[in-house]
């Protein structure tokens, strides 16, 4: 049954909102999709979760959520916010998750984000952000997940990322980024997942991924690359790589020499004609390899050290004979 305390908690539930105890004597408050144009005023100080998404909130006043020191998750997605003032999140010392996606922000709200030392997850996707100031994430030392996809970025905000050494996952997909410079992510040594798909990337600095020593997933699908991304060679822990739907015409010799942990490579929908014979050597974790329409392949690929393939598809090539060792190389 409910304790006396939970009854007290529920008396602090704003009108029309749905509230329930979170199991730790704190309150989860759901005020989503109620047509609200401003924040509710009578929130319990013991609120740990507040969902204000899918409303018509167009502005936040400074310090709109006073004394919510136990608030861990704040959802403001799907509103009409164009600007978030300094002090909007003052006093939210426990805030771990902040969702601001699907608004109309044009800039990262730098001043509002300052001093959110507990913040672990920040969603800024599906806004109109075209500029990320150099110091905008400088106080977010606990940040683990950052969404900046579906915005209007034209370049990687290199300086802004320098302070995010704890970051584990980031998406910059669905922007208008055209180039990744050397050391773009140089301080992101904890990053495991990086999504860069659906941009306009046509060139990569030779050292653009240097420093990403923990990276396991890299998504470069749906870009304008016309050369194989040799910059991946420093990614020794890479497990999943996507560069399908680009304009890459050849996969060079020793293409994946620095990526011995690769399990999955997606590179379909590229006009690949040439594949170096040694391109797929020494990939012991690789399970599937599909090469369609590589018309300039005349020799069967050398799969030395790639012994766990479960599926190999070669179509449109000009291979006239199979090496005697092919059955020894495959399981």
């Amino acid at each position: 049954g409910s304790s006396p305390r939970s009854g007290v908690l529920l008396r602090g539930c704003p009108t029309h909102c749905h509230c329930e105890p979170d199991g730790r004597m704190l309150l989860r408050v759901d005020c989503s999709d109620l047509g609200l144009s401003e924040l509710p005023s009578n929130l319990s100080v013991f609120t740990s979760y507040l969902d204000l998404s899918m409303n018509n909130i167009s502005q936040l006043l400074p310090n709109p959520l006073p004394s919510l020191r136990f608030l861990e998750e704040l959802r403001l997605a799907g509103n009409a916010l164009t600007y978030i003032p300094k002090g909007a999140f003052t006093g939210l010392y426990s805030l771990k998750v902040l969702m601001l996606q699907n608004n109309q922000l044009r800039h990262v709200p730098t001043e509002a984000l300052q001093n959110l030392r507990s913040l672990q997850s920040l969603r800024l996707d599906a806004n109109h952000i075209s500029y990320v100031p150099p110091s905008c994430f400088s106080g977010l030392h606990s940040l683990r997940h950052l969404w900046l996809d579906d915005n209007a970025l034209t370049e990687i905000p290199v300086q802004a990322f320098r302070s995010l050494s704890a970051l584990q996952a980031m998406t910059l997909a669905l922007n208008k980024i055209h180039h990744i410079p050397d050391y773009a992510f140089g301080n992101l040594s904890s990053l495991v997942v990086l999504h860069l798909h659906n941009n306009r990337i046509h060139s990569l600095g030779k050292k653009c991924f240097d420093g990403l020593h923990s990276l396991e997933t890299l998504d470069l699908n749906y870009n304008n690359l016309d050369e194989f991304p040799t910059a991946i060679r420093t990614l020794s822990n890479l497990k999943e790589l996507g560069f399908h739907s680009n304009n890459i015409r050849s996969i060079p010799e020793k293409a994946f020499v620095g990526n011995p942990s690769l399990i999955t490579i997606h590179f379909y929908d590229n006009p690949i004609q040439f594949v170096g014979r040694s391109a797929f050597q020494h990939l012991p974790e690789l399970r599937t390899l599909t090469l369609n329409g590589a018309s300039q392949i005349t020799e069967f690929p050398d799969l030395t050290g790639t012994a766990n393939l479960e599926s190999l598809t070669l179509t449109g090539a000009q291979i006239s004979s199979l090496p005697q060792t092919v059955c020894n190389q495959l399981p």
Epitope: R162, T234, S236
Partner: antibody, heavy 118, light 111 residues
């Protein structure tokens, strides 16, 4: 602990070649560039070139391009610098270093003195 | 090639006093907001040791009396309170473009 250990001192005649080795340990060899830098007696530091071990990615200072070959063997985590057509002005301490944070040289070998003398 | 010019060539400073070394690049070494300028310390008979990377970031394990500043073409290495063990030659280096180049070095001694 990251370590770069270089081969011993060499004395060579003008026109000869020298090959200096640099054995790395304590980190993933193929994930970092190895840089080569030299220092003539009493002089400053001069960058020679770099390699990303395991790949064919190398870059050379144009000044040395025709005489220098940088290679690496990932099976032994060893990088090599070969300099041919030696002349007296190539007398120097040759260092290997790891390209670390943003390409800064964060770990260095102890250096190999190459003396070119007739 | 980018030419790196350090000043002064040598510097004598009293123990506990501030030492300042300047480095000027012949062209900007900034890219996307990062200054590709690093500082090294070299003691006699030893390889250089990284002190500062990207103009102002202290390398792990380096005492905080060392600091770096500057951008584009003009950079400074400061030792806030010189210690006896700081006697060495200090080099700046750019890796903005090949060939990577070093300054000629600044010798720091005790007055």
């Amino acid at each position: 602990e990251v370590q770069l250990v270089q081969s011993g001192a060499e004395v060579k005649k003008p026109g000869a070649s020298v090959k200096v080795s640099c054995k790395a340990s304590g980190y993933t060899f193929s994930a970092y560039w190895i840089e080569w830098v030299r220092q003539a007696p009493g002089q400053g530091l001069e960058w020679i070139g770099e390699i990303l071990p395991g790949s064919d990615s190398t870059d050379y200072n144009e000044k040395f391009k025709v005489r220098v070959t940088i290679t690496a063997d990932t099976s032994t985590s060893t990088a090599y610098l070969e300099l041919s057509s030696l002349r007296s002005e190539d007398t120097a301490v040759y260092y290997c270093a790891r390209g670390g944070h943003y390409g800064s040289l964060d770990y260095w070998g102890q250096g190999t003195l190459v003396t070119v003398s007739s | 090639d980018i030419v790196m010019t350090q000043s002064p060539d040598s510097l004598a400073v009293s123990l506990g006093e501030r030492a300042t070394i300047n480095c000027r690049a012949s062209e900007s070494v900034d890219n996307y907001g990062n200054s590709f300028m690093h500082w090294y310390q070299q003691k006699p008979g030893q390889p250089p040791k990284l002190l500062i990377y990207l103009a102002s970031n202290l390398e792990s394990g380096v005492p905080d009396r060392f600091s770096g500043s500057g951008s584009r073409t003009d950079f400074t290495l400061t030792i806030s309170s010189l210690q006896a063990e700081d006697v060495a030659v200090y080099y700046c280096q750019q890796n903005y473009e090949d060939p990577f180049t070093f300054g000629q070095g600044t010798k720091v001694e005790i007055k």
